[in-house]
Amino acid sequence: EPHSLRYNLTVLSWDGSVQSGFLTEVHLDGQPFLRCDRQKCRAKPQGQWAEDVLGNKTWDRETRDLTGNGKDLRMTLAHIKDQKEGLHSLQEIRVCEIHEDNSTRSSQHFYYDGELFLSQNLETKEWTMPQSSRAQTLAMNVRNFLKEDAMKTKTHYHAMHADCLQELRRYLKSGVVLRRTVPPMVNVTRSEASEGNITVTCRASGFYPWNITLSWRQDGVSLSHDTQQWGDVLPDGNGTYQTWVATRICQGEEQRFTCYMEHSGNHSTHPVPSGKVLVLQSHWQ
């Protein structure tokens, strides 16, 4: 799994007027890492995980860079011609990755009102855009502005690929990112669904990294995908992740079903609690 740094900048306009505030979120290896608030930008660690790892480091450099990025994106939004009345947003997402073989990937994506309209591979400098006429118009608009105002937006757009990778390497070097494995806690619960049926839910929480296999098995055989419901793998705010899988089974058949979990090379099976016991908690052996 590669190391990654992801910047998510959002600026807003109201009735054609670009708002002064902006929001910047930075994710490090998929985890919320830094955030600049809408009105005043002060880079600050997100959650207990970031605080524990980052300690009392000051974030002046990041605050300066993110503030500059926000200003530049506001300038870009001001040059989008089809500003209609009401609320509109321009979002830029920039991602860079360092893979285990030291190869790198960098990309930049623009969204208007939540819809992707322009992407750039920052290594090859190749631009791509969706086929819709709206996206094409927006893309031409923004690309023309970036070409015309290259000097004004230099802080934001110049050598973004190098800047992003430089920051990521700096964080890696300073020990901010720890290659760690945190095993999940697995809970299996049951709830009445309908006459003669129960829903069994298997929840995995507190795990890192995010890759996990979670599925229901009957007599040791995986149930088909369409008989199971999966939740998204989501950050839980502690630098770890959570997810779930559920299926509906006949009452009395509980002992034939197990939740299978695989994470970072470790695996375990978890039975359905019988009778009145509602929650069964277990770690791997």
């Epitope: 009957q218 007599d219 040791g220 088909s224 299978y260 695989e262």
Partner: antibody, heavy 120, light 107 residues
Framework: EVQLVESGGGLVQPGGSLRLSCAAS????????MNWVRQAPGKGLEWVSY????????YYADSVKGRFTISRDNAKNSLYLQMNSLRDEDTALYYC?????????????WGQGTLVTVSS | DIQMTQSPPSLSASVGDRVTITCRAS??????LNWYQQKPGKAPKVLIY???SLQSGVPSRFSGSGSGTDFTLTISSLQPEDFATYYC?????????FGPGTKVDIK
């Protein structure tokens, strides 16, 4: 005593069809998932298809997908395999096998097999 | 699909010998591994399930071990009725696959 008896095998030309049956007795058929497994003459075992007891999970080997259909009739305690577009390489002894309750996808009882020969 | 390999393909042994057959999966299959015995003209019979659990009615001289990708079936003291072909089978994936078999015959 658990018994599985296959039938329906025979000689068929390439491109032809056959329907195999497996009659189950000695256990509550509707509570068990079932499989078809085949064995070409002098060769090893090859899993063909799986159907769970509630009939909402069915799997096929890539080699038969789109040509074979597994089904069951719990009222008749029977398992079926409809085989279409048969090929020379489908020639084999076909076994039905029961999945053990609370096992690890374990086939705990097998029939004696029915021979399918595909040849022109 | 997950490929299963077995070694050796065949072996000759004497009554009383300790026999070990190995099975390797092309990717991790946790403990979803079963062992079967098949005698000529007969249907297979399950010996071990879940990599190491002995099926009811199977003599205790049969044992299984392993997890992940490497598994072993051991017959602690070979008996005349144990001369047969042995197959491993994975059920981790929903495309169940068998190993090619190991034939155990009399030396």
């Amino acid at each position: 005593e658990v018994q599985l008896v296959e039938s329906g095998g025979g000689l068929v030309q390439p491109g032809g069809s056959l329907r195999l049956s497996c009659a189950a007795s000695g256990f509550t058929f509707s509570s068990y998932s079932m499989n078809w497994v085949r064995q070409a003459p002098g060769k090893g075992l090859e899993w063909v298809s799986y159907i769970n007891y509630s009939e909402n999970t069915i799997y096929y080997a890539d080699s038969v997908k789109g040509r074979f259909t597994i089904s069951r009739d719990n009222a008749k305690n029977s398992l079926y395999l409809q085989m279409n577009s048969l090929r020379d390489e489908d020639t084999a002894l076909y076994y039905c096998a029961r999945v053990m309750v609370r096992g690890t996808g374990t086939f705990d009882y097998w029939g004696q097999g029915t021979l399918v020969t595909v040849s022109s | 699909d997950i490929q299963m390999t077995q070694s050796p393909p065949s072996l000759s042994a004497s009554v009383g010998d300790r026999v070990t057959i190995t099975c390797r999966a092309s990717q991790s299959i946790s403990s979803y591994l079963n062992w079967y015995q098949q005698k000529p003209g007969k249907a297979p019979k399950v010996l071990i399930y879940g990599a190491f659990s002995l099926q009811s009615g199977v003599p205790s001289r049969f044992s299984g071990s392993g997890s992940g990708t490497d598994f072993t079936l051991t017959i602690s003291s070979l008996q005349p009725e144990d001369f047969a072909t042995y197959y491993c089978q994975q059920s981790y994936s929903t495309r169940f696959t068998f190993g090619p078999g190991t034939k155990v015959d009399i030396k």
